[in-house]
């Protein structure tokens, strides 16, 4: 029978015929930077080619002995995970391995460094086709690490990275808290996060999604037909790798933009339990479980957007969060949000010739996040447009005047410390979906998108008495772009995206005494791209 | 992540001193800042990457470790460069002592340095 | 469905050797670790020991220096050897696998999930 | 080698009641403990693994808890199909170690 992590990770589709095609990932070469490896167990003989590069520190101990089967134990599991006969993932992939971690798993930044940049010389030397780097090993935070990841990943190298098994945020250790970087978490066959003894799976907005770490039969360095169970989540971004080298076989001219999407899109959503992770990363944790596309081949039609969680600002009074998308990402909206309530809102600016999203503490506020929705949007022509405070009653709107300019998300910015409670009288007037409508004491910012076939609706969801959560999803076929709240009042902590939902959040209604007239709606922006649709069908 | 290193726990120190004479004051208005891991037993003192500005040639390297080992000896400081770094990354692997970190700090192309760390198997 | 069975003489004469095989069915033996247990009339459960199919071996202190388990992998078998028994071995023996796995943090660990399938116990009587 | 001691050896309840056994271990082995109930003739069989992880098909009234030193098996509601012996065993180190066993019988 298919061990249950190789069933968690395969489409329905698949399982009543056979697990996968037999060559997946054969276009593919997985660089493994870990421990020796035992390349002649049954599993991994001849897909694993062992590389001369060994930069590892000595054993811990006088007394330690090195022996094969303990040196080799590590990455002979993580290569059969990825590539094994019987239970890899991507079984027609390629491997070459790096020795950066010695017989007693542990290893150096400085070594590993090494290791990377060898992997970009011999990809300058003797270029092929896609690869993907596994680095299944974490250390403390290092901006030297995450650099050379971000080098790598910009000459257009997949890195994927365990998140840490240290049951901490994934951000406080590298390589998983490096942005280019495809950070993975670890759940069992429960999809519950894994946890055994003290540790137990990272989380956080540096983890982009999970996928099975717990009790994974692969091959063991015991012998050469031996197996063994190993958990962790080394063991959840080898998955995370073949399924990678999958798409990658199946669609080599993927980016690393369009791959993390397409990760995102086709995995499990929200099954993951998150009473599991503290209260205050709940919110910025995925609950994505990755999983292999329903077919090899085609999901270019669609817009692929995810949702991007700044660091936390900091409590000081003008302190800022800023999110950001990746190089070949279209930042489309921006909203923000704070547990204590007390924001300035947020609003879209360009850095360095590209948009970011930046969220604005408010006095006595205990910080505050950018949320950034970012999405792959060929051939885009975005621009923020803003208005000031109206001071009207009417409350403030900006539109999109362009020609073809949709909106694709609204933003609110506002100077004073309190808004007071505001209900425009009428959200959207008919015939004017591309305006944005806030407060009349609050600047408002609409992103104003041009792009083949692009269309976009808005979509609201009021409910008359305060609620402590509200929510609004674009229908099948359509994806969020933006999702904002109206009133920006103050007891609204504040909206951002989780997958193709809109969640607005406003503070326990029992403790503000809130009344009718602050009723909040979540509005979404849903978007589809005509062109996308036409130039797949016309490729089918 | 970001530009938010300063947002974790690793310890930032920009060290501006007078100028040492022997060196050449990096760039007006910038100071190379020096880093090192969060977790104490994960540190490893006496390595550290020097990392230098973006567009800094392996010939440019390569005399920027020379010098540092030039101007440690002067001090009486062993140093060995263990690794020239480029292709990813403009710099070099030093070992050395930490008194020299200051020193180091101040030559030109020096971005940061950061003390080397320990990785696990995970 | 994984399934155990014991097999061996029911009966073992005083300072001879106690042997028994344990037979695995719809699983492979070549990834989890199995054990024998003994449990004497009326009373509580004794660990013996595991052995790993890689022939790794582990056993009970109380017991070491009269005890080995073996491996036969084409079998699917493993077996228990106890010399110089004496009536207090008399036992119902059991074999049972122990599912562990390992995760590192800055060490390796190893962690069991117990032993989640037994098999359905023999009785030796150590007897003249 | 780690002791487990367990209480009570012997319980009299009814069906319906609830249920709890406690298990001792001698040193912290953190939540590294299983649960095994056996009935008269039969092999043991898996309830819990680490303190309160409930065994695959294990119904739902039985709940395990503790860590450290001290662990305690809770059936909610007792059914006729429980009467039987309860044992612990540490999974922290070899050799594996058992308590002696609670047996509980029908009032």
């Known amino acids: 029978s298919i061990p249950w992590n190789l069933e968690r990770i395969t489409p329905p589709r698949y399982r009543a015929d056979e697990y996968q095609p037999p060559d997946g990932g054969s276009l593919v070469e997985v660089y493994l930077l870990d421990t020796s490896i035992q390349s002649d167990h049954r599993e991994i003989e001849g897909r694993v080619m062992v590389t001369d590069f060994e930069n590892v520190p000595e054993e811990d101990g006088t007394r330690f002995h090195r022996q094969a089967s303990k040196c080799d134990s590590h990455g002979t599991h993580l290569a059969g995970v990825v590539s094994g006969r019987d239970a890899g993932v991507a079984k027609g992939a390629s491997m070459r391995s790096l020795r950066v971690l010695n017989c007693q798993g542990k290893g150096t930044v400085s070594g590993t460094l090494i290791g990377l940049e060898f992997i970009r010389k011999s990809q300058l030397v003797q270029p092929v086709g896609p690869l993907v780097v596994l680095l299944p090993l974490a250390g403390g935070y290092s901006r030297v690490l995450n650099a050379a990841c971000q080098r790598l990943a910009r000459a257009g190298v997949v890195l994927v990275t365990a998140a840490g098994n240290f049951r901490d945020d994934a951000c406080l250790y590298s390589p998983a808290s490096a942005p280019e970087v495809i950070t993975v978490g670890a759940t069992n066959a429960q999809d519950q996060p894994v946890t055994l003894g003290t540790l137990g799976t990272n989380f956080g907005r540096c983890v982009d999604l999970f996928a099975p770490g717990e009790d994974i039969i692969g091959a063991s360095s015991d012998c050469s037909t031996c197996f063994v169970s190993q958990s962790g989540t080394s063991q959840a971004a080898a998955h995370v790798a073949g399924i990678a080298a999958m798409m990658l076989s199946a669609e080599p001219e993927l980016t690393l933009a369009e791959l993390r999407q397409r990760l995102i899109h086709f995995s499990a959503k929200d099954v993951i339990n998150e009473a599991w992770f503290p209260e205050d990363q709940r919110v910025l944790t995925p609950n994505l479980v990755a999983a292999l596309p329903p077919s090899t081949h085609g999901a270019g039609w669609q817009l692929f957007c995810r949702t991007v969680w700044s660091a936390h600002s900091g409590p000081t009074r003008m302190a800022t969060a800023i999110a950001r998308c990746a190089p070949d990402e279209e930042l489309l909206s921006c909203s923000s949000f704070s547990r204590s309530g007390k924001r300035r809102g947020e609003r879209m600016e360009a850095q360095g010739g590209k948009l970011v999203c930046r969220a604005h503490n408010a006095f006595g506020g205990e910080g505050v996040y950018a949320i950034a929705r970012c999405c792959l949007l060929p051939q885009a022509n975005c621009s923020v447009h803003t208005a000031p405070p109206a001071e009207a009653s009417m409350g403030t709107r900006v539109h999109c005047h362009q020609q073809g300019h949709v909106l694709t998300g609204c933003s609110s910015h506002w100077e004073v410390e309190d808004l007071g409670t505001h209900k425009p009288p009428v959200l959207r007037p008919r015939g004017q979906p591309n305006q944005c409508v806030g407060h009349r004491e609050a600047s408002i910012h609409a992103s104003c998108c041009h792009a083949p076939g692009l269309e976009c609706k808005v979509k609201e969801h009021g409910i008359p008495a305060p609620q402590e959560q509200v929510t609004v999803a674009c229908e099948e076929g359509w994806t969020l772009t933006g999702c904002s709240a109206l009133p920006g009042t103050s007891h609204v902590l504040g909206a951002y995206a989780v997958d193709n939902t809109c969640v607005v959040r406003s503070r326990d209604v029992s403790t503000t005494g809130s009344t009718s007239e602050e009723a909040v709606t979540a509005v979404a922006i849903c978007c589809r791209s005509r062109h996308l649709a036409q130039a797949s069908q016309e490729l089918q | 992540q970001e530009d938010e290193d300063g947002d974790y726990e690793e310890l930032v120190l920009a060290l501006r001193s007078e100028e040492d004479g022997l060196a050449e004051a990096p760039e007006h208005g910038t100071t190379a800042t020096f880093h090192r891991c969060a977790k104490d037993p994960w540190r490893l003192p006496g390595t550290y990457v020097v990392v230098l500005k973006e567009e800094t040639h392996l010939s440019q390297s390569e005399r920027t470790a020379r010098r540092l080992q030039a101007q440690a000896a002067r001090r009486g400081y062993l140093t060995k460069i263990l690794h020239v770094f480029h292709g990813l990354l403009p710099g070099f692997l030093v070992k050395m002592s930490g008194d020299l970190l200051e020193l180091a700090l101040k030559l030109p192309h020096v971005d940061y340095i950061e003390e080397d760390s320990s990785v696990f198997a995970q | 469905q994984v399934q155990l069975q014991e097999s061996g003489p029911g009966l073992v004469k005083p300072s001879e050797t106690l042997s028994l095989t344990c037979t695995v069915s719809g699983d492979s033996i070549n990834t989890y670790y199995w054990s024998w247990f003994r449990q004497p009339p009326g009373k509580g459960l004794e660990w013996i020991g595991y052995?790993?199919?890689?022939?790794?071996?582990n056993y009970n202190p109380s017991l070491k220096s009269r005890v080995t388990i073996s491996i036969d992998t084409p079998r699917n078998q493993f077996s228990l050897k106890l010399i110089s028994v004496t009536a207090a071995d008399t036992a119902v023996y059991y074999c049972a696998r122990e599912r562990i796995t390992m995760i590192r943090g800055v060490t390796l660990y190893y962690y069991s999930y117990g032993m989640d399938v037994w098999g359905q116990g023999t009785t030796v009587t150590v007897s003249s | 080698d780690i002791q487990m001691t367990q209480s009570p050896s012997f319980l009299s309840a009814s069906v319906g009641d609830r249920v709890t056994i406690t298990c001792w271990a001698s040193?912290?082995?953190?939540?590294?403990l299983a649960w095994y109930q056996q009935k008269p003739g039969i092999a043991p069989k898996l309830l819990i693994y680490?303190?309160?992880t409930l065994q695959s098909g294990v119904p739902s009234r039985f709940g395990g808890s503790g860590s450290g030193t001290e662990f305690t098996l809770t059936i909610s509601s007792l059914q006729p199909e429980d009467f039987a012996t309860y044992y612990c065993q540490q999974l922290n180190s070899y050799p594996r170690t058992f308590g002696q066993g609670t047996k509980v019988e029908i009032k």
């Open positions: 040193q912290d082995i953190s939540s590294y």
């Open positions: 680490a303190a309160s």
């Open positions: 052995i790993y199919y890689s022939g790794t071996t």
